[in-house]
């Protein structure tokens, strides 16, 4: 089982453990080996203490266990004699956050350890480009996050503050949308969402390329490159090429780095180069027609980054077509 947790040591027998919503975790506790072991894990809020898990007289005692912990906790029974009183905690919820005390008594001594459990969540955010009538918007969206993240925007690497923030979920987890109006701008934009508890940061970067003017029946090359500053070599990512038309996006091609599989939804679309180095995802669109005019969007996304590259293609009638008219 993969247990995601961060251990922070602080004085006075107190540890801070950070877990992720819905995942499992171990609350650590060790003691000097001794016989006649008694273990009581308790949760304490401002008003009360609740029995999480007890062990004495050689077996787990769950008669007085609080119902919220039913079937979610266990001890490492075969390691108790070695001084391990750690608690295995399943399916973390935000309500599990708080102070836990582990009481251990033996024939030699009795001790109490304190563990502070903090629970975080950070579902991979998204950066979306939207056109509404004549306006263009960038939206940074995180569907589920806790605690409240720090969201920052940059325009051409300079921090900016004008953004519209929408938040749902009063106690958490939160769903957050941060929207920036970029109508008429040729600047590049960057949105960073940081979960300080989980020490996780996601960055979305948007770049508008110069407009491309092409003739009917020609082909166009649309560049899209993976910037090494953003992506580490072993990181899984996906590439999506789509076309924006009347505010609606339709997918043209899709690539998954984990399987190295490409799916094309438009027969005139192909990679510029073989994807040997997996860094250049430029595309060719052949046999252009007037209806191919519009905005083309390349989206390279991983757990930590989204890179959006926009190309505006103008297809003009060829000379022959023009003279025929």
């Amino acid at each position: 089982i993969f247990l995601s947790a961060f251990f922070t040591y602080v004085p006075m027998n107190e540890q801070i453990i950070i877990g992720r919503l819905g995942e499992d975790i171990i609350l650590p506790s060790s003691f000097e080996r001794g016989s006649e072991v008694v273990i009581h894990w308790k949760y304490q809020d401002s008003y009360n203490s609740y029995n999480v898990h007890s062990y004495y007289k050689g077996s787990g005692r769950l008669e007085s266990q609080d119902t919220r912990y039913a079937n979610r906790t266990s001890l490492f029974y075969n390691e108790i004699q070695n001084g391990n009183a750690s608690l295995f905690f399943r399916r973390l919820s935000l309500l599990d956050e708080g102070i836990y005390t582990c009481y251990v008594g033996t024939a030699i001594q009795a001790i109490t350890n304190k563990v502070v459990l903090k629970v975080g969540v950070f579902l991979t955010p998204m950066m979306k480009y939207e056109k509404r009538n004549t306006n263009s918007f960038l939206i940074c969206n995180v569907l589920s996050v806790y605690p409240r993240p720090i969201i920052t925007w940059k325009m051409d690497n300079t921090p900016i503050s004008e953004n519209n923030m929408q938040e749902t979920g009063s106690l958490g987890p939160f769903s957050i949308n941060s929207t920036l109006n970029i109508t008429g701008s040729n600047s590049s934009y960057e949105c960073t969402i940081e979960n300080s508890l989980l020490k996780q940061t996601w960055t979305g970067r948007w770049t508008m390329k110069d407009g491309l003017h092409k003739m009917q029946s020609e082909h166009v090359s649309l560049s899209c490159e993976l910037v090494n500053d953003y992506f580490s070599p072993n990181q899984d990512f996906k590439v999506t090429w789509s076309r924006m038309e009347s505010g609606i996006s339709s997918i043209l091609a899709y690539y998954l780095s984990s399987s190295q599989n490409t799916t094309f939804y438009e027969s005139r679309f192909s990679w510029n180069k073989e994807l040997k180095n997996q860094s250049d995802f430029s595309m060719n669109l052949t046999d252009l027609s007037l209806s191919d005019s519009g905005e083309y969007l390349c989206n390279i996304s991983s757990d930590e980054y989204t890179l959006l590259t926009i190309h505006t293609v103008h297809v003009e009638p060829s000379q022959e077509t023009a003279s025929d008219n």
């Epitope: 009581h40 004495y56 007289k57 009481y103 008594g105 001594q109 009795a110």
Partner: antibody, heavy 120, light 106 residues
Amino acid sequence: QVQLVESGGGVVQPGRSLRLSCAASGFTFSNYAMHWVRQVPGKGLEWVALIWYDGSEKYYADSVKGRFTISRDDSKNTLFLQMSSLRAEDTAVYSCVREYSSGWGYFDYWGQGTQVTVSS
Amino acid sequence: DIQMTQSPSTLSASVGDRVTITCRASQSISSWLAWYQQKPGKAPKLLIYKASSLKSGVPSRFSGSGSGTEFTLTISSLQPDDFATYYCLQYNSYYTFGQGTKLEIK
């Protein structure tokens, strides 16, 4: 070394109340369950009450249930037994006792006791 | 409630003797039994816990055995300091003491 010293005993009339105290030293009081045990001189021992290390659970012998209340003040390292509606059969030496931990375990240290006499 | 029956109630013996005190439970208490020694005017002192575990600092001439309902405390070679009253305690379900065995000099 572990020391338990009881006080508060005395002569009391039937139906009246009395509060016993036990001052603990030589160990981390808040880490141990504490009990009261009584003994009629020349007779046997009887367990009276238990309070868990954190005060979260309290248990009583049937003979005192509803009349006696066990409590603790960890900041003062003191155990208490509030006795009300006293009866002649409550006459005994009351001892404060430490459990080796806090899980219905055996007793490892006892105080000398304080005499309670219920008589009209 | 679990009843504890201790026997004999009085036992006369001499220094150097091997003596055995028995405790019987009214129902099984597994090994959750302790033995105590009490001298007049003094607090009881723990000798044995979990039926057979010797408390540290207690002389090895004391030993305990048994499980379920039958338990014994044995003093292999009586010393002058051992003359006292002995109690068993079950701690399987709440707490019950035996009525005590007074060990006196013959």
